[in-house]
Interface confidence: low
């Protein structure tokens, strides 16, 4: 056997090159046949009425043919025949790759409660061979469950991801990434997770600066409440007592001028948003006017309440971003 060919893999719509090579030539006729065993070329003559086949090279040692605008129907075995005695035959297999036509993420629901499992589906349509779908949450790879549907030699792959959502997922993209031999680099689409959570409350003493509250001094407390959405209500209350008459409330700030011992107690900043409520307590102790040995400073304690965290999903589809996954992993 001195007739050789090589298998060809080509992307749909591109050009396939078929080569029949003879090692020891004796000027025998070389013929190329299609999968239906119709003659495409007999030496340098093309009897087949398909102008997509063009002769690239013809000699006693090689018949080289190009096939333009390859379609999936062109797939199969192409036969090279060498008219020696006895005749020799070798075949080359043309494999046509079809990239996925479309990549879509479908989310079961727009909002989800933290701790709940949501279903995310990604579909890569009409590819050949079947597409491999990979899932990432940020830079962490997750496992999806894929189902393949075949129709007319083409494959539609749907991958289902069951994702348990957490507050920490806020702003993290869920990425559906496609790997396919007909796609250079990574084809991907993603959704950014937006997590809503109850406020986190922190009280800061902005006056006095040294943190020691004495009779006759002024006190200024600022309540910082961070949540998503931003807390709509920030209120000050005095726990188990009325707010002093000389206390001034201004938004997140609490001012108490001319402190006296009757002001001792716990002052609570409460914040709420649509998700839930939280609070932080400041325990005020008013000390005597200055002495030689300063007593210990006042303390702040924070308490939060158990509430529900909501997740909202915002769409942001991007395709063909290469190298976007490697960057970070933990």
């Amino acid at each position: 056997q001195n007739l050789f060919t090589k298998d060809v893999t080509v992307i749909e719509g591109e050009v396939a090159t078929i080569s029949c090579q003879v090692n020891k030539s004796d000027d025998s006729v070389i013929q190329l046949l299609n999968p239906n065993r119709q003659t495409i070329y007999f030496r340098d003559f093309r009897p087949l009425k398909d102008s997509r086949f063009q002769l690239l090279n013809f000699s006693s040692s090689e018949l080289k043919v190009s096939l333009t605008n390859v379609s999936i129907s062109d797939e199969g075995r192409y036969f090279c025949q060498l008219y020696t005695d006895p005749p020799q035959e070798s075949y080359t297999t043309i494999t046509v790759l079809v990239p996925p036509r479309n990549l879509m993420i479908d989310i079961q629901k727009d909002t989800a409660v933290e701790g709940e499992e949501i279903e995310v589906n990604c579909t890569a349509m009409a590819s050949k061979p079947a597409t491999t779908i990979r899932w990432f949450k940020g830079n962490t790879e997750l496992k999806g469950k894929s189902e393949v549907e075949e129709w007319s030699d083409m494959y539609t792959v749907t991958s289902q991801l069951m994702l348990k959502v957490h507050k920490e997922d806020d702003g993290v993209p869920v990425i559906c990434q496609v790997e396919h031999p007909a796609v250079t680099g990574n084809l991907q689409t993603q959704r950014y997770l937006e997590v809503q959570y109850k406020p986190q409350v922190h009280i800061q003493m902005t006056y006095p600066l040294q943190g020691l509250t004495r009779e006759g001094d002024a006190l200024e407390l600022t309540c910082e409440a961070i949540g998503k959405p931003q807390p709509v209500m920030v209120t000050w209350v005095r726990v188990d007592d009325e707010m002093p008459q000389h206390a001034v409330l201004s938004g997140p700030n609490l001012f108490i001028n001319n402190l006296n011992k009757t002001d001792n107690g716990t002052y609570r900043c409460e914040a709420s948003n649509i998700v839930g409520k939280a609070h932080s307590d400041y325990m005020l102790y008013v000390y005597d006017p200055p002495t030689t040995i300063p007593p210990p400073t006042t303390t702040t304690t924070t308490t939060t309440t158990t509430t529900t965290t909501i997740l909202t999903i915002i769409t942001d589809s991007r395709a063909g971003e290469e190298g976007s996954i490697r960057a970070v992993d933990h």
Epitope: T140, E141, K164, R326, D329, H330
Partner: antibody
């Protein structure tokens, strides 16, 4: 040759500090997340810390959080682990490892 | 906090098949990888992505996962396969976790 080579291990008193280094060669260091994994004598493997390819993100096991610091110098192809406030239970062979979401290359370790 | 559990030790006759299992809830969500560690040596990756084998790893090593259990199978165990095998995955925060490991003895 693709390899990782750790150094910097040694004997240290409780409360002391050590800095481990891991020199990478034979691959594009700046493209890979890197890790430290340790193994106490006669025990199993324990993940210690991770760092992203750029160095922008770091993660630590609870057992070392606040005491150990992972860092990298991509211009020198080197990974570091600064270990402070060392305890007897930190005694182990420390391996540096490379990978995406699994460890596909390991160093020989430093004790 | 997720945990992975493996049998501490398993024995196999030379040329026979041995299956090591690793159980944990994280295996429902995250890929498992398996590492071989011979005495006095660094670990070596033998299986990743549940069932993919790195180049250079003999095809007698294979992996699979069903629900919360990952398995490493050595078909036709050789003397050089005697080692500790560790399963690795992620916890709920995405941090790596290793199982305690299984010592495989080839008889």
């Amino acid at each position: 040759e693709v390899q990782l080579l750790e150094s910097g291990g040694g004997l240290v008193q409780p409360g002391g500090s050590l800095r481990l280094s891991c020199a990478a060669s034979g691959f594009t260091f700046s493209r890979y997340p890197m890790y430290w994994v340790r193994q106490a004598p006669g025990k199993g493997l324990e993940w210690v810390s991770s760092i992203s390819s750029s160095g922008g993100l770091t993660h630590y096991a609870d057992s070392v959080k606040g005491r150990f610091t992972i860092s990298r110098d991509n211009s020198k192809n080197t990974l570091y682990l600064q270990m402070n406030s060392l305890r007897a239970e930190d005694t182990a062979v420390y391996y540096c490892a490379r990978g995406d979401w699994y460890f596909d290359l390991w160093g020989r370790g430093t004790l | 906090q997720y945990e992975l559990t493996q049998d501490p030790a398993v024995s196999v006759a030379l040329g026979q098949t041995v299956r090591i299992t690793c159980q944990g809830d994280s295996l429902r969500t995250y890929y498992a990888s398996w590492y071989q560690q011979r005495p006095g040596q660094a670990p070596v990756l033998v299986i990743y992505g549940d069932n993919d084998r790195p180049s250079g790893i003999p095809d007698r090593f294979s992996g699979s996962t069903s629900r919360n259990t990952a398995s490493l199978t050595i078909t036709g165990a050789q003397a050089e396969d005697e080692a500790h095998y560790y399963c690795n995955s992620r916890d709920s925060s995405g941090n790596h976790i290793f199982a305690t490991g299984t010592k495989v003895t080839v008889l």
